[in-house]
Amino acid sequence: NWVNVISDLKKIEDLIQSMHIDATLYTESDVHPSCKVTAMKCFLLELQVISHESGDTDIHDTVENLIILANNILSSNGNITESGCKECEELEEKNIKEFLQSFVHIVQMFINTS
């Protein structure tokens, strides 16, 4: 469930603190409820960037697990189509710390509406 997603995010946050990854990532910091699935897709795609850049097994495994969890939760809600949402590339670029904080925020939005 989404609580496990948050714990994976916290784990990623802890893991990257010991590394020096200075990537900037497309970050949706003001998610409109009608675009939350689109925003989630952008967050997950950017997480894969973190995984690539880190070259770390623990981060890699945690990112994959997080994507598997999110996929399964969202698939159980059926196909959700959203329109008029920003493309990932249109989002503001932020550092990893801000990116992860915004990610936790959107997951909490899913928890509050489930």
């Epitope: 699935v37 989630m40 897709k41 997950l44 795609l45 894969q48 995984s51 690539h52 097994t57 623990d58 890699h60 495994d61 945690t62 990112v63 994959e64 697990n65 994507i67 598997i68 999110a70 996929n71 399964n72 969202l74 698939s75 059926g78 196909n79």
Partner: antibody
Framework: EVQLVESGGGLVQPGGSLRLSCAAS????????MSWVRQAPGKGLEWVAT????????YYPDSVKGRFTISRDNSKNTLYLQMNSLRAEDTAVYYC???????????????WGQGTLVTVSS | DVVMTQSPLSLPVTLGQPASISCRSS???????????LEWYQQRPGQSPRLLIY???NRFSGVPDRFSGSGSGTDFTLKISRVEAEDVGVYYC?????????FGQGTKLEIK
Amino acid sequence: EVQLVESGGGLVQPGGSLRLSCAASEFTFSNYAMSWVRQAPGKGLEWVATISRGGDYTYYPDSVKGRFTISRDNSKNTLYLQMNSLRAEDTAVYYCARRVSMITGGWAMDYWGQGTLVTVSS
Amino acid sequence: DVVMTQSPLSLPVTLGQPASISCRSSQSIVDITGNTYLEWYQQRPGQSPRLLIYKVFNRFSGVPDRFSGSGSGTDFTLKISRVEAEDVGVYYCFQDSFVPYTFGQGTKLEIK
């Protein structure tokens, strides 16, 4: 050439336990997630378990959840499947397979072992 | 769970002729990141399964170019442009977009 060699199969009574092993060679074992897939005699393939590269994350279908445990020892390049509370319907050839990462190539079991037969019967 | 349904279950083909196998999923297997994790595996008689196609249409290394994959959403197809004797066996589609990962029932290809 990538090699995966399963062992540990055999005849076991219903309710019994068995541990399968899969010895990996000719690739960096710790860089790959791994899976077990089984095939009952004359039947199709069924996914049984997957484990992440580091071993922290495991995935199972409901048919084996709580009875089977996938694990790995990266220092020994070996994958395991601990099978408890075995049932007649667990009778199958068990294959181990190397799994390409979602992040690097998009999920796929690219190399398979030759399989080991598990027979559950009284 | 995602159910994968293959057709036909048996496929008699003349050597040199094309063959086509269909695979339908009970729901879309496009994942949240937009990827479709659909593979095709071949199992020759008495052998272990072998990866042919991954992510719908990507041929695995060493797989002859007479094999091709296509499709999207819930409908997928494996095509063999000209069947050869070594193609005899059972073909399985497999989805690993969503846990539990699931195989189709298999399609047995035989020579007429």
